[in-house]
Interface confidence: low
Amino acid sequence: SSPCPQAWGPPGVQYGQPGRSVKLCCPGVTAGDPVSWFRDGEPKLLQGPDSGLGHELVLAQADSTDEGTYICQTLDGALGGTVTLQLGYPPARPVVSCQAADYENFSCTWSPSQISGLPTRYLTSYRKKTVLGADSQRRSPSTGPWPCPQDPLGAARCVVHGAEFWSQYRINVTEVNPLGASTRLLDVSLQSILRPDPPQGLRVESVPGYPRRLRASWTYPASWPCQPHFLLKFRLQYRPAQHPAWSTVEPAGLEEVITDAVAGLPHAVRVSARDFLDAGTWSTWSPEAWGTPSTGTIPKEIPAWGQLHTQPEVEPQVDSPAPPRPSLQPHPRLLDHRDSV
């Protein structure tokens, strides 16, 4: 068996730090066997079998010119193997941030705080923080740690599924390279990192006979749970074409009638979402949708769609130890602003 411990990384590669003494190990011999060392591509003997260093090559104060492939051979000329020296630095604590697009799952991303120049991997785990007793924090099996599964495509991201909205979590991201490991711990709560995805399916339609009205409608983002315990509130902005300033309203539901549109001009509309009890932050804005008020006279009767509709209440779920949150579906306000005459 080889006398050389295999560091994590590609086979046949050994590692060192610039400015430090580096020992290279001849992999194909018995420990202590005297070997000759050559730099690949050059016949010059770097270290002979009489060095007293056995199967190792010592490079004092290695620098970038020492990087490359080395060849060792035994006394009888048998090839002992090839070793590639790669210089770099031990890991530094990675930069970690976490975000949630819904209240049941969150993801964490990371990046190196320093470039090590070496093959690097990341170990990701998390645990739920619980306090048992008055003055001590102890671990129980239900608190982890558990692995935070990483994206299969190699993106620097892991996802925690089935998180509890009211719990605190400690994320552990450890950067590992052949020269060591370094850990970043990050405490997160879903409430503080919640940022929904923007609403989807934004449509802007004219209201026949109302030259200053536009009707906007949208849906919850697909990433928000289908039967939500927690609702979203919305913020809608609109402006006529070529006007720099946005007007902002906070609709009560999934549609809004704008009553002060500029007749005859196309309008841009966009919408943003946030947890309805103000956890986390507002989403980014949805892509803009455009609409132009209709031309024509006001009809004598309010069309059927203009009547107020209510949605049935959603029963709060009580299978969670979390305090219940109000879960009424707000009434959509269709005709909430008086038309300017």
Partner: antibody
Framework: QVQLVQSGAEVKKPGASVKVSCKAS????????MHWLRQRPGQGLEWIGN????????HYNQKFKDRVTMTVDKSTSTAYMELSSLRSEDTAVYYC??????????WGQGTLVTVSS | DIVLTQSPATLSLSPGERATLSCRAS??????LHWYQQKPGQAPRLLIK???QSISGIPARFSGSGSGTDFTLTISSLEPEDFAVYFC?????????FGQGTKLEIK
Amino acid sequence: QVQLVQSGAEVKKPGASVKVSCKASGYTFTNYWMHWLRQRPGQGLEWIGNIGPSDSKTHYNQKFKDRVTMTVDKSTSTAYMELSSLRSEDTAVYYCARGDYVLFTYWGQGTLVTVSS
Amino acid sequence: DIVLTQSPATLSLSPGERATLSCRASQSISNNLHWYQQKPGQAPRLLIKYASQSISGIPARFSGSGSGTDFTLTISSLEPEDFAVYFCQQSYSWPLTFGQGTKLEIK
């Protein structure tokens, strides 16, 4: 650019010796190993051995050890390979190749040695 | 001596196709395996060193993989000039030895 120019074709009788030369240019001759290889007609490649031009340290394939001698003349940047006790199965194209310690990066054009009675 | 066995002996493919050539060693040689291309009447040319390391001036369509005893040379999309004989060579122990070659011919 790196160039390896070999001596011309040879016809030898069984039992004789042949000495093939390889003149190097375009690089520092004493920095690289010189390998010798051969390829019999329609066959694969066979490594004969190598020599370190700076110290003339050689490694020979055991198959040829008793019949091959590799030398260098640093003053003319020329490497030589002599094979003795030739037999018909030594008929082949013989190549010199400048290499890393174990690789063959630049090749001569080849020298055909025919052994025939 | 370490014996290298290449397969197949002959591979018939068309330009644009992907070629996969195999080389198996009689004992583990780590990554000390190299690939050469030889065209009729020419000396061999080094394509890949140490199983997977590319060589300057060699087109990116040539790649290598493997470690231990099983190695592969892949040509992602064959060009007309790629039809030749390919040899693997080991540098794990003396004597340095070659496979018997794979002839890549136009179908």
